[in-house]
């Protein structure tokens, strides 16, 4: 996959770049995974709608000690305005699924690649 | 067309609490968030904090942390924001506004606006 | 948090004339993924806000394209071209990069 420079390049890039560039960390993440993904740590699943970036950063920043998505939740938080912590819910319902890292990765991934595809959102 | 339609005003006494209403209309409920925002009179406008429907994730200006709760219902495409604990300072007009985001990032701006509920808090 | 500026405070204006808007900010408003989120809002007397234009220069659907915002980073500016008289009220900045997300104090457009 090519790397386009995103994050470490000097300026500002385009949102369409910056998502394509969150799309493909995540393909690097799914091909390249030998063992099980962050020791097949569990996280909250997410629903994937308006706000699926908090959202997922949410999820993702509980997982410690996992060096494979760490690119990954820096990532994130550049799609996300808010400030997010680990321990973190801002959902005031309660969570009741949860799915191994590889699994929510996956299902980001396509989710992201749809809606990369369509060029909409709402 | 995008409504929002909002409850109507308040009288209440200090230290007492009050949930207003913000009905959507003319859109998918869930793929928009909801921001409230306040307005004193004769001032600006002041960012409460917004809901995404579709998750009932809420994020506030730590202004108004502990002061409002923001909920939704998706059956009646409903969100509400309940103040606590009310003083004079409370006193204002406060708006719903759909919350729009693109596919790129959860970044946005308000659209479209409810016509206020004015909230008065007097003894 | 960020904060917003706006000059004038109050425009008095001729109907058909240009007038010109000044918003300012605290900090740079340009998010590293390129977008810059300013906004602009015209509240009418006993209305609600409604919504002018967005990132910086985008005129939001049905808004009359003698508006036009333009500017970067920390100054931006909002341009009527021929000021009609349903263009009266408050005009407000706003920005949406940073949070809490912030709004400017407004300026008054009204006929001289």
């Known amino acids: 996959l090519t790397c386009l420079g995103g994050f470490a390049s000097p300026g500002p890039v385009p949102p369409s770049t910056a998502l394509r560039e969150l799309i493909e960390e995540l393909v690097n993440i799914t091909q390249n995974q030998k063992a099980p993904l962050c020791n097949g740590s569990m996280v909250w699943s997410i629903n994937l709608t308006a706000g699926m970036y908090c959202a997922a950063l949410e999820s993702l920043i509980n997982v410690s000690g996992c060096s494979a998505i760490e690119k990954t939740q820096r990532m994130l938080s550049g799609f996300c305005p808010h400030k997010v912590s680990a321990g973190q819910f801002s959902s005031l319902h309660v969570r009741d699924t949860k799915i191994e890292v590889a699994q929510f990765v996956k299902d980001l991934l396509l989710h992201l690649k749809k809606l990369f595809r369509e060029g909409q959102f709402n | 067309q995008v409504q929002l339609q909002q409850s109507g005003a308040e009288l209440a006494r200090p230290g007492t609490s009050v949930k207003l209403s913000c009905k959507a209309s003319g859109y998918t409920f869930t793929t928009y968030g909801i921001s409230w925002v306040k307005q004193r009179t004769g001032q600006g406008l002041e960012w409460i904090g917004e809901i995404y429907p579709g998750s009932y994730n809420t994020y506030y200006n730590e202004k108004f942390r502990g002061k409002a709760t923001l909920t939704a219902d998706k059956s009646s495409s409903t969100a509400y924001m309940q103040l606590s604990s009310l003083t004079s300072e409370d006193s204002a007009v406060y708006f719903c506004s759909r919350w729009r985001t693109s596919y790129f990032s959860d970044y946005g701006y308000f659209d479209y606006w409810g016509q206020g509920t004015t909230l008065t808090v007097s003894s | 948090d960020v904060v917003m500026t706006q000059t004038p405070l109050s425009l008095p204006v001729s109907l058909g004339d240009q007038a010109s808007i000044s918003c300012r900010s605290s900090?740079?408003?340009?998010?590293?993924?390129?977008?810059?989120?300013l906004h602009w809002y015209l509240q009418k007397p006993g209305q609600s806000p409604k919504l002018l234009i967005y990132?910086?220069?985008n005129r939001f659907s049905g808004v009359p394209d003698r508006f036009s915002g333009s500017g970067s980073g920390t100054d931006f500016t909002l341009k009527i071209s021929r000021v009609e008289a349903e263009d009266l009220g408050v005009y407000f900045c706003?920005?949406?990069?940073?949070?809490?997300?912030?709004f400017g104090g407004g300026t008054k457009l009204e006929i001289k």
């Open positions: 900090q740079s408003l340009v998010h590293s993924h390129g977008n810059t989120y």
């Open positions: 990132t910086v220069s």
């Open positions: 706003s920005q949406s990069t940073h949070v809490p997300y912030t």
